[in-house]
Amino acid sequence: APVLPGEDSKDVAAPHSQPLTSSERIDKHIRYILDGISALRKETCNRSNMCESSKEALAENNLNLPKMAEKDGCFQSGFNEDTCLVKIITGLLEFEVYLEYLQNRFESSEEQARAVQMSTKVLIQFLQKKAKNLDAITTPEPTTNASLLTKLQAQNQWLQDMTTHLILRSFKEFLQSSLRALRQM
């Protein structure tokens, strides 16, 4: 239950608090996923030197990872709630194939990788509920996703490490932008 305004006492009987609003629930869920990404990034950085690679070097990749742009209406200037919500949901749906790719990429954080994937599905569901009347949301083609997954898994070890790092970094940035935008809604 959410904390009531001004309440910070230690031992209280259950107050008749309000249930979490849709926005509060989404906010908590994004933070949950971000904490998972941090754990996965930690393992990736310990395992390879990708985290030290320059942004320029990492940018030389052919991954089509979702990214927020000015036209998406999620930034403070030109903010548009409906356009932005569509972008967030569409972006998360596009990230799903990359999160599937991550599933076999971790040893000690295998459960976290699964939790991030599952929680993203839950987040999409929470957001779709918020965007009930928006019909501009396109779902990626399963066949396209399947061939992309096969292609990513066929890369050599160095490229797989690079891909893992890029997915985590991009997903973190996308979620952080989404969190900021959603707090304005």
Epitope: Y32, Q112, V122
Partner: antibody, heavy 115, light 107 residues
Framework: YPQLVESGGGLVQPGGSLRLSCEAS???????MSWVRQAPGKGLEWVGS????????YYNDNVLGRFTISRDNSKNTLYLQMNSLRAEDTAVYYC?????????WGQGTLVTVSS | DIQMTQSPSSLSASVGDRVTITCRAS??????LAWYQQKPGKAPKLLIY???DRYPEVPSRFSGSGSGTDFTLTISSLQPEDFATYYC?????????FGQGTKLEIK
């Protein structure tokens, strides 16, 4: 490893104390958490919950004043300190993520209060 | 506190049957209701939240409906793995309260 793992259960005499732990993965650091219990062969009962910072705790009336929920975010661990235990506190105790509904649960730890 | 009453408390059915479990709240709780499935010796698993939203990866044969005081969990075609105990929970106000459970057994 599982995301939530409870420990600390066991046999304790009436009037005694016990501290349960719930080791959580890092994902739960910014989450409200709850303890839920289940007496043998009975239904589920919410015990109480705690805010992410640990600054606010909420309890069911039947444990208020006897049980204390706390957390140590540096250790990713949630605690349930149980004092003045009674026979009716005998149950499997679960920790769970609290989004008002509980979407992730530990496997539970059994607490038996008996002389 | 809000009381949650589930019916029936136990139910025998066969694979392929359509099954309905009901949950009644002692006062209006809007759609703040969740359904869980629990198997012996295991933790509960969330099936439905907000009255009718299926949690991801829960099979589509499970559906929830209702608002206010009366709620229903329906399993459209029972599968062998569905034999378990089902609980409803209100989160309209704390203390959160659960129904007493419905044990679904094989006929």
């Amino acid at each position: 490893y599982p995301q939530l793992v409870e420990s600390g259960g066991g046999l304790v005499q009436p009037g005694g104390s016990l501290r349960l732990s719930c080791e959580a993965s890092v994902l739960f650091k910014h989450q409200d958490m709850s303890w839920v219990r289940q007496a043998p062969g009975k239904g589920l009962e919410w015990v109480g919950s705690i805010s992410p910072s640990g600054g606010s705790t909420y309890y069911n009336d039947n444990v208020l004043g006897r049980f204390t929920i706390s957390r140590d975010n540096s250790k990713n661990t949630l605690y349930l300190q149980m004092n003045s235990l009674r026979a009716e506190d005998t149950a499997v105790y679960y920790c769970a993520r609290d989004l008002d509904f509980m979407d992730e649960w530990g496997q539970g730890t059994l607490v038996t209060v008996s002389s | 506190d809000i009381q949650m009453t589930q019916s029936p408390s136990s139910l025998s059915a066969s694979v392929g049957d359509r099954v309905t479990i009901t949950c009644r709240a002692s006062q209006g709780i809007s759609n703040y209701l969740a359904w869980y499935q629990q198997k012996p010796g295991k933790a509960p698993k969330l099936l439905i939240y907000d009255g009718d939203d299926r949690y991801p990866e829960v099979p589509s044969r499970f559906s929830g409906s209702g608002s206010g005081t009366d709620f229903t969990l329906t399993i459209s075609s029972l599968q062998p793995e569905d034999f378990a105990t089902y609980y409803c929970q209100q989160y309209y106000s704390t203390p959160y309260t659960f129904g007493q459970g419905t044990k679904l057994e094989i006929k």
